[in-house]
Each structure stands twice: as C-alpha cells, then as structure tokens.
C-alpha cells in the first residue's frame, strides 16, 4: 500500500481550524490477521530523509497519538486529547485519516508527517509516511479562511518503506 | 504483549557487552523504547531512549559508552569499556517513562543482570 | 533534568498517611509527565501514577498524585502492609541529553 497526501500546503489564518489529511492507497488488506496503526507528529524536511525526526504536535509525541484497529474499524483519539489540546485524530473505514487542530496559533506552522504502520501477525511489518506543511498567518495578507493547495501526483503517492 | 531483556552476564573490566531486548506482541515503530539500570541495593538510573528510524538520547554520563539500536523487532544497547560500577540489573522498556497514556503504553521487562568482576 | 526526591526514607504505622515530594530542576514536559513508580525487591518497578495524578489500573485509590510543573507529590493514604516498597518519581523533559531522570527513591517501611 501508499500513503497518499491530497494536500501539500495548508494555509491558515490564525484562530482558524484546520485538518490535515492522508490516505491509503491500496490493496489494502482487510484480513483478520492485519493491524493497522496510524499516527501523527511534526518533522523537519531533512536532508537525508523527510519526516525522519519526529517532535510532539501541541506537546503530544507520535507515541501519544498513535491510533490502532484491524482493517475494518474506524478509530478516533480520545475526548481527553480534543478538550486538553485541541487536536482530534480520526480514521475511517476508507482509509481516509486526518488530525484535526483547533484554534491555530503560529507556533502550529511546520511540517507535519502521517504514518501508518501495517502488521501482518507472525509476518513482518510495512511502515509508509506522508508529510504536508501548515502555514498559519497573521495580519492583513492572511487569508480569511484556510486555502490547500493539492500535491503533485508524484508527490501525493509518495511512499517511504521501512 | 511483552518486551525481554536477554545478554545479561558475568564480564571482566574493559569488556563490551551488548544487551538484547526482544519485544512482541506490538510494534517498535509506535512507541519510545527505553534503557533503564539498578546497580544492586540502589535506585533507578535512565540510560536512554530512542524510536524507530530517529536519534538516540542518553543521559550525560551514559554519552559515548553506552548506544542504543534497534531493529525491526529487537533494541540493543551496547556497552564499552565496563566497569564495575556497571554492574546493576538493566531494563528495557516501553515508552519515554512518563508516557501520557501510561496505562497503555508503559511496559517493562524483568531485567537481566550484568556483573562486572575481575 | 535532575529530579530531586523528599525524603529517602519513611517509617510509618499502619493506617497513616505518607507524603513524598519530587522536586524537578526545569518543568516537565508539558507540566505533566512525570510518573510514580512502586518497587518491590526482585521485582521491575510497577506504574502508579502517570500525567502527575492519573491513577494506572489497578492501582488502589489510596494512592494519588498531585502537582505540576516543577513540584509533584505522591500521597499514599491509610498505609497498609503490603505498601512497604521503594518508590520512584519519573520525569520527562522532552528529547535531548538528559531528556528523562527518576528521583532517588523513598523507601517506605510500614510498622
């Protein structure tokens, strides 16, 4: 499977909400016998490889984040990370998934990357990722709501394999 | 779901020795995986941590002697030039520690013992 | 971070109620993360408290915790025998040198 980012930039005014999106491209798998993990963190665009660094979003690591279901369920991040920090993580049974970050400051522009990691029990795994950038402006040039801009088909598959 | 720490042995001083943990049951892309040490009769000491494809971090006196590596399923620590302050049962666990969901994400192993002795 | 634990030992009668004090050098990250770990001998430490006051499954109400920031404390309240045991606060300051440090311990004997 790929990860696909349909965005590649997010442009926000401040105190606005924003959700960043990626999604599976397939096959993907729906047996009984694949997990899928998915989650979310902020990068720096590395020289060597993108998304490799993985610092906290809104002082939640990938680790807090991370959201687990076999390949049938949808899965959300619990109501205590919407309320404390403003953040929703969530997955449907498309493959679609998406953070959701309310109240944009600018401390919240940079890089943001998706993983999602894929187990096949007794098997081993296969890890993909996706990266998109948030800008959030302020002042009289910001837009007056957020404005995406689509990634470039090359771009928007772009697989990173473990 | 489980994580044990195996390589655990009675060395000489000046000895490297790599320790082994092996986890399952979950995946190492996911979470913090950390080294945690108690010499015998003492406190706890962290070693370090690292998380899949990202830089290890160590504490100020374990720089340079101790590394921490990982594969798909195992994390290493490698330890230069033992002394016998080294001896203590060393740890593997999951996550950074002070895990915000520590119900589910903190695991740890039984500990295997090294001693360093001449 | 250095994080500095009051104090290292503490006898106390079955029944009462034990504090213990966990003093940071630098806030944890976010505030919050800092864990209570309970040690018995032979046995890994076994998660109390985590995120400063949320209790870990299992783990009975007698025990709490409190604090942010810099300061945090571990309550322990009608001390029963088998409370007797090492216990460790846990820090984390984020991803660097030092990013992570337990107290010293406090034992508890229980009378």
């Known amino acids: 499977f790929k990860v696909a980012t349909p965005y590649s930039l997010y442009v926000c005014p401040e105190g606005q909400n924003v959700t960043l999106t990626c999604r599976l491209l397939g096959p993907v798998d729906k047996g009984h016998d694949v997990t899928f993990y998915k989650t979310w963190y902020r990068s720096s665009r590395g020289e060597v490889q993108t998304c490799s660094e993985r610092r906290p979003i809104r002082n939640l690591t990938f680790q807090d984040l991370h959201l687990h279901h076999g390949g049938h369920q949808a899965a959300n991040t619990s109501h205590d990370l919407a309320q404390r920090h403003g953040l929703e993580s969530a997955s449907d049974h498309h493959g679609n998934f998406s953070i959701t970050m309310r109240n944009l400051t600018l401390l919240d522009s940079g890089l943001y990357c998706c993983l999602v990691v894929e187990i096949r029990h007794h098997h081993s795994e296969h890890r993909v990722h996706g990266a998109m950038e948030l800008q959030v402006q302020t002042g009289k040039d910001a837009p007056s709501n957020c404005v995406v801009y689509p990634s470039s088909s090359q771009d928007s598959e772009n697989i990173t394999a473990a | 779901q489980s994580v044990e720490e195996s390589g655990g042995r009675l060395v000489t001083p000046g000895t490297t020795l790599t320790l082994t943990c092996t986890v399952s049951g979950f995946s190492l892309s996911l979470y913090y995986m950390s080294w945690v040490r108690q010499a015998p009769g003492k406190g706890l000491e962290w070693i370090g941590m690292t998380y899949t494809g990202g830089s290890a971090y160590y504490a100020s006196w374990a720089k340079g002697r101790f590394t921490i590596s990982q594969t798909s399923t195992t994390v290493d620590l490698k330890m230069t030039t033992l002394t016998v302050a080294d001896t203590a049962t060393y740890f593997c666990v999951r996550g950074y520690l002070a895990d915000y969901y520590g119900d589910r994400d903190n695991l740890w192993g039984p500990g295997t013992l090294v001693t360093v002795s001449s | 971070i250095v994080m500095t634990q009051t104090p290292s030992s503490k006898s106390v009668p079955v029944g009462d109620t034990v504090t213990i004090n966990c003093q940071a050098s630098e806030s944890v990250f976010s505030d919050d993360r800092l864990a209570w770990y309970q040690q018995k001998p032979g046995q890994p430490p076994k998660l109390l408290i985590y995120?400063?006051?949320n209790l870990a499954s299992g783990v009975p109400s007698r025990f709490s915790g409190s604090g942010s920031g810099t300061q945090f404390t571990l309550t322990i309240n009608d001390v029963v025998c088998d409370d007797a045991a090492t216990y460790y606060c846990a820090g984390y300051k984020g991803d660097s040198t030092d990013g992570v440090a337990f107290g010293g311990g406090t034992e508890v004997v229980v009378k």
């Open positions: 995120r400063a006051s």
